[in-house]
């Protein structure tokens, strides 16, 4: 396994509606042709798999259906889109990148960005 | 759009340096990770050396580590490979690529790159 280097924004906010994207840069030493791209979360000491999708280079990058992560890719950087998040989703969310194909294996883990996520305040009820 | 055009290519002798140029013009090239590829007749493109956007981050393959140097200046535009103690097997077109980032890396695989300049033809002989 060779260390490889990734790099991610520090900080992100979510919107009103619980989206939050961020770019996840990886400097591939050499010819990927299959990439796995890992979201890790780490709050209170633990680590948990949020999702995770393997892609061929120049093809989309999917993930599972049931997945809350969307995500496209570009090159040596992936646009990674996390939905459905509420308050208590509030993080590090760390982006980890495998190079699986062909050999060798490298594998890159970055630093995390740190998502906060605010629920909306519930609309006062109107007199009308 | 970016375009890119490699400059001092030629004929060296054994042991002897260049310094190749890749200039930018269309768009600032600080916003680019930039990559040098070589590729000589009948064989495979070759990966060389990569810088990132900002200069702090570079790459190279185990095979020029040591021989070729990547730098950069944004207020030029121009990236550079300085190459020294050059062997006859160096001979090859060399090309530079770029690849809009939005982070410090860059990439060694010509996978990423998507704009390439036209190449420079380095000639090793005595």
């Known amino acids: 396994c060779k260390a490889m280097h990734v790099a991610q924004p520090a900080v992100v906010l979510a919107s009103s509606r619980g989206i939050a994207s961020f770019v996840c840069e990886y400097a591939s030493p050499g010819k990927a042709t299959e990439v796995r791209v890992t979201v890790l979360r780490q709050a209170d000491s633990q680590v948990t798999e949020v999702c995770a999708a393997t892609y061929m280079m120049g093809n989309e990058l999917t993930f599972l259906d049931d997945s809350i992560c969307t995500g496209t890719s570009s090159g040596n950087q992936v646009n990674l889109t996390i939905q459905g998040l509420r308050a208590m989703d509030t993080g590090l969310y760390i982006c980890k990148v495998e190079l699986m194909y062909p050999p060798p294996y490298y594998l890159g883990i970055g630093n995390g960005t740190q998502i906060y996520v605010i629920d909306p305040e519930p609309c006062p009820d109107s007199d009308f | 759009e970016v375009q890119l055009v490699e400059s001092g290519g030629g004929l060296v002798q054994p042991g002897g340096s260049l310094r190749l140029s890749c200039a930018a013009s269309g768009d600032t090239l600080e916003s680019f990770a930039v990559g040098w590829f070589r590729q000589a007749p009948g064989k495979e493109r070759e990966e060389l050396a990569c810088i990132g956007r900002t200069g702090e981050f570079t790459d190279y393959p185990g095979s020029v580590k040591g021989r070729f140097t990547i730098s950069r200046d944004n207020a030029k535009n121009t990236v550079y490979l300085q190459m020294n103690s050059l062997r006859a097997e160096d001979t090859a077109v060399y090309y530079c690529?770029?690849?809009?980032?939005?982070?410090?890396?860059?990439?060694?695989?010509?996978?990423?790159?998507?704009?390439w300049g036209q190449g420079t033809q380095v000639t090793v002989s005595s």
């Open positions: 690529a770029a690849e809009r980032l939005v982070f410090h890396l860059c990439s060694l695989s010509e996978y990423d790159y998507d704009t």
